[in-house]
Amino acid sequence: MAVTACQGLGFVVSLIGIAGIIAATCMDQWSTQDLYNNPVTAVFNYQGLWRSCVRESSGFTECRGYFTLLGLPAMLQAVRALMIVGIVLGAIGLLVSIFALKCIRIGSMEDSAKANMTLTSGIMFIVSGLCAIAGVSVFANMLVTNFWMSTANMYTGMGGMVQTVQTRYTFGAALFVGWVAGGLTLIGGVMMCIACRGLAPEETNYKAVSYHASGHSVAYKPGGFKASTGFGSNTKNKKIYDGGARTEDEVQSYPSKHDYV
């Protein structure tokens, strides 16, 4: 029950995280015009990964896409790549984890397969979260660097008395959304990995032992790694004939009352 809850919660947390990563990637407010200690302008500039926007005091907003690939800073391209990789991995992880959920039964899928899928999705969520956090952090670092550079050259003389004020940019809402979303995806992934351990407890590799009272030799029947629903015996779902052990491939798994939540 605790394993199912952990897995379910991990899935939900990851789902929210990936939705957040997608939202952050699409948001225009990755960097926003710094209004502190700056001459107050009647226009507000903000920029995203895909376009830059200007909002006039009337509320009129005009956005322009970055219609070039080669002309964009390498760092921006790297951030885009990290966020997209994060989304793709997260989406695949979500797809895998849906089938891995204990509360969902698909055909005669074994617990071992569910455990492997849970682990796979967990790792995908962890990598997805790390990609998002890395992407957002790279962008934030780029902003901090540019901020102090533009502060140093806040007023650049243009000959005579004329001055031009350089627009400084600070952290936008998308950065915070990205950090939180990346963190949630990471936490969700860790929860999935923890759930996987519960789904697949450490068991002896010696699945069944055949004892012969009259003989001196002991025949061991090796069995593969078996996932179970709990930490107890896994024989409840096995049909055992004549006390003989069967191989994993021959074992028919049936739903038990514990398989549905």
């Epitope: 015009q33 302008t41 009647a42 830059s52 200007v54 005091s57 322009r64 031009t164």
Partner: antibody
Amino acid sequence: QVQLVQSGAEVKKPGASVKVSCKASGYIFTNYWIHWVRQAPGQGLEWMGRIYPGTGNTYYNEKFTGRVTMTRDTSTSTVYMELSSLRSEDTAVYYCAREGYGKGNSMDYWGQGTTVTVSS
Amino acid sequence: DIVMTQSPDSLAVSLGERVTMNCKSSQSLLNAGNQKNYLTWYQQKPGQPPKLLFYWASTRESGVPDRFSGSGSGTDFTLTISSVQAEDVAVYHCQNAYYYPYTFGGGTKLEIK
């Protein structure tokens, strides 16, 4: 059509206050900023501040902060500008103007002006 | 505050003549985000309120005759009337529409010879 109709001329004594009204019609009153600009005799234009009728948010020119108050009455689509502690140099024509949407922060419609004379 | 300087203060021209007036700002009015100059031109005829002519330095307001044109970028801007008509007699004001407080130039008075 868009119209901004201002109140009539005022004569005030130094130290007094004046309240000029600007009634808007022909558009959604709460959606556009209203600015106040004054023009002293034979002088250029001077921006005093602005008010957003939808929320009542104001932004004043620091030169007038403490002396100017802009308010609005959404029920009558009217904006008011009150200038206190009047001095002789406040003698001017006071205009209200609507800020256009998507017009580079410019004022596309103006009231006819209200002449305020400050004289002892 | 941004200082807007207009030149000349006044000019007298003949009908049909081409006229140019200038406006200079103490700081750049170009917004890097959209590459637009937040400079506005107004025309004020005697006894009337100002009338919007141009915004974003060169975008003509609807109803403004095409003999009027606006140009310039950064700190230097120009208003040109290709062929002056009698109804163009007015004071022309330029306005900084980028920084608060909004500031206006002293105006250029156009008269007919």
